[in-house]
């Protein structure tokens, strides 16, 4: 079941769909699930280089 | 780094089928989505369809159910059966691998040419 | 289904000019979670595309400074501000808000004049 907006705003401006941490978005089954099940950008290894933007792990999105 | 490669394109005659191979290195098709898009000759980028890690399936309402994603996660690759093929379907056929966090196309494989013809 | 319309559908340019391509969707690209998933490709002929611009201004990994990305709700824009050899190709735009099914613009082919 989808969460609906807290709070009325303009239609460019929805309220954020809240996903707890280590959830993130899933925009076909329209919910949040475990980042892990996505693929989501790792943590890397300090100096460790990757082919960016697998960078820090917002799951908000 | 992942990587995607096609195989199974080839010349089929109208009404035929065929399947096309998607075989992952890198990265486990049981996380994420994983993608089919076609590009006809001299034409735009048009999205098949794809199968997630649950192994759910999405596809573009266009194709009329005439195709089917499946996949063999013992061989980290996922399939694209074609059936009554058409004319229309003559296209290069990509697999590719979506990005979660952006739901972006990050990784693409080199393409597959499916020729319709009789 | 988001329709995406691209213009110009191609376009000649010389090198150092800046282009700009523009991108326009059936309705908004603004999800409910306030992302707005609107990307940008580079495909050359007999090659798969390559993502160049990822929700709406982010440039990819290696992608060169010249390539930058605006706008938002229905209208987008990819600007290339001085027009390199390397450069001539064809440019998609695409959305990932209203899935299934994602959905590319037709495309611009950038052309050496």
């Known amino acids: 079941m989808r969460r609906g907006p807290r709070s009325l705003r303009g239609r460019d401006a929805p309220a954020p769909t809240p996903c707890v941490p280590a959830e993130c978005f899933d925009l076909l089954v329209r919910h949040c699930v475990a980042c892990g099940l996505l693929r989501t950008p790792r943590p890397k290894p300090a100096g460790a280089s990757s082919p960016a933007p697998r960078t820090a792990l917002q799951p908000q999105e | 780094e992942v990587q995607l490669v096609e195989s199974g394109g080839g010349l089929v005659q109208p009404g035929g089928s065929l399947r096309l191979s998607c075989a992952a290195s890198?990265?486990?098709?049981?996380?994420?989505?994983w993608n089919w898009v076609r590009q006809a000759p001299g034409k735009g980028l048009e999205w098949v369809g794809n199968?997630?890690?649950?192994?759910?399936?999405y596809y573009n309402p266009s194709l009329k159910s005439r195709f089917t994603i499946s996949r063999d996660t013992s061989k980290n690759t996922f399939y694209l059966q074609m059936n009554s093929l058409r004319a229309e379907d003559t296209a290069v056929y990509y697999c590719?691998?979506?990005?979660?966090?952006?739901?972006?196309?990050?990784?693409w494989g080199q393409g597959t040419l499916v020729t319709v013809s009789s | 289904d988001i329709q995406m319309t691209q213009s110009p559908s191609s376009l000649s340019a010389s090198v150092g000019d800046r282009v700009t391509i523009t991108c326009r969707s059936s309705?908004?690209?603004?999800?409910?979670?306030?992302?707005?998933?609107l990307h940008w490709y580079q495909q050359k002929p007999g090659k798969a595309p390559k993502l160049l611009i990822y929700?709406?201004?982010n440039r990819f990994s290696g992608v060169p400074s010249r390539f930058s990305g605006s706008g938002s709700g229905t209208d987008f824009t990819l600007t290339i501000s001085s027009l390199q050899p390397e450069d001539f190709a064809t440019y998609y735009c695409s959305q990932s808000t209203h899935v299934p099914p994602f959905t590319f613009g037709q495309g611009t082919k950038v052309e050496i004049k």
């Open positions: 929700k709406v201004s």
């Open positions: 590719a691998g979506l990005d979660g966090l952006y739901w972006y196309f990050d990784v």
């Open positions: 199968i997630g890690y649950s192994g759910s399936t």
């Open positions: 890198g990265d486990s098709i049981t996380s994420g989505y």
């Open positions: 309705q908004s690209l603004v999800h409910s979670n306030g992302n707005t998933y």
